[in-house]
């Protein structure tokens, strides 16, 4: 079952290392792949003393951890390199950091939900 799936055909492209990698620095990247595979957009960046440095943006291959993510949001607490992925055209144009700590179980005995 797949709910509200949005196709990804193109993503914002950026490569901070563009000269060494011999790519464009910025642009729009068409996302190619097998017809039976999903495609996503991604962004990676660093936070250097409060200043955001984009490392790369572009297309990301089929990855279940990107399913159902319409926004590109890094949720890991204090990563070295920030990463997010999402589904939908150009969904990596904006990216954000919203750390979510581990939710600890309540100490009382909760009622188990029915399946």
């Amino acid at each position: 079952a797949i709910l509200g799936r949005s196709e990804t055909q193109e993503c914002l492209f950026f490569n901070a290392n563009w000269e060494k990698d011999r790519t464009n620095q910025t642009g729009v990247e068409p996302c190619y792949g097998d017809k039976d595979k999903r495609r996503h957009c991604f962004a990676t960046w660093k936070n250097i003393s409060g200043s955001i440095e984009i490392v790369k943006q572009g297309c990301w291959l089929d990855d279940i951890n990107c399913y159902d993510r319409t926004d590109c949001v890094e949720k890991k607490d204090s990563p070295e390199v920030y990463f997010c992925c999402c589904e939908g055209n150009m969904c990596n144009e904006k990216f954000s950091y919203f750390p979510q700590m581990e939710v600890t179980q309540p100490t009382s005995n909760p009622v188990t939900p029915k399946p």
Partner: antibody
Framework: EVQLLESGGGLVQPGGSLRLSCAAS????????MAWVRQAPGKGLEWVSG????????FYTDSVKGRFTVSRDNSRNTLYLQMNSLRAEDTAVYYC???????????WGQGTLVTVSS | QTVVTQEPSFSVSPGGTVTLTCGFN?????????PSWYQQTPGQAPRTLIY???TRSSGVPDRFSGSILGNKAALTITGAQADDESDYYC??????????FGGGTKLTVLG
């Protein structure tokens, strides 16, 4: 430390039902896809089911489609596998696994044994 | 129906090198299938060795390495040790929510 603890296994008659649970700790459960993998006695590993971060997308191996339902409760850090119309060939140790980016299983539980027999 | 094939069994001498392979019936294995490798000893849960073709999981010794060899994914163990005697499974991510496990290779370390 990442921990995955399966429970709910046991002996059940053919045609019966069981619900497996996997309690997760040591990581932010709601941020990662999860999967169930099983291993019949003396056999290899077999992927059973997967679920996306929100639970909005669920996936199954052909042999369990229509009989098994995977779900998750992100507020309780728990993954579930509801197994109905159980068959002898569903007898296996069932493992839950955390899925990391590039869709691989980075952490595994210790497994819970399901035996389907009359 | 995708079938992922591995050698059913393999033997290696202590200190030797062994390469286990992982192919499938629908064509060539490439990095886009994100091949991963898992080690399992009897009665234990699997342990993640290699992911994304060639990245070692945390704590895995560098004797283990992953690659693409021809049209297959490969796991190479150099300087095999007695405690490498285990079952090894490869997994291919087929995309669209589907994984397929290989049948596993039982590795025996001789002596």
């Amino acid at each position: 430390e990442v921990q995955l603890l399966e429970s709910g296994g046991g002996l059940v008659q053919p045609g019966g039902s069981l619900r497996l649970s996997c309690a997760a700790s040591g990581f932010t459960f709601r941020n990662y896809a999860m999967a169930w993998v099983r291993q019949a006695p003396g056999k290899g590993l077999e992927w059973v089911s997967g679920i996306s971060v929100t639970g909005g997308s669920t996936f199954y191996t052909d042999s369990v489609k229509g009989r098994f339902t995977v779900s998750r409760d992100n507020s309780r850090n728990t993954l579930y596998l509801q197994m109905n119309s159980l068959r002898a060939e569903d007898t296996a140790v069932y493992y839950c696994a955390k899925v990391y980016y590039t869709s691989f299983f980075d952490y595994w539980g210790q497994g819970t044994l399901v035996t389907v027999s009359s | 129906q995708t079938v992922v094939t591995q050698e059913p069994s393999f033997s290696v001498s202590p200190g030797g090198t062994v390469t286990l392979t992982c192919g499938f019936n629908s064509g060539s294995v490439s990095t886009s299938y994100y091949p991963s490798w898992y080690q399992q000893t009897p009665g234990q849960a699997p342990r993640t060795l290699i992911y994304n073709t060639n990245t070692r999981s945390s704590g895995v010794p560098d004797r283990f390495s992953g690659s693409i060899l021809g049209n297959k994914a490969a796991l190479t163990i150099t300087g095999a040790q007695a405690d490498d005697e285990s079952d090894y499974y490869c997994v291919l991510w087929m995309g669209s929510g589907i994984w397929v496990f290989g049948g596993g290779t039982k590795l025996t370390v001789l002596g």
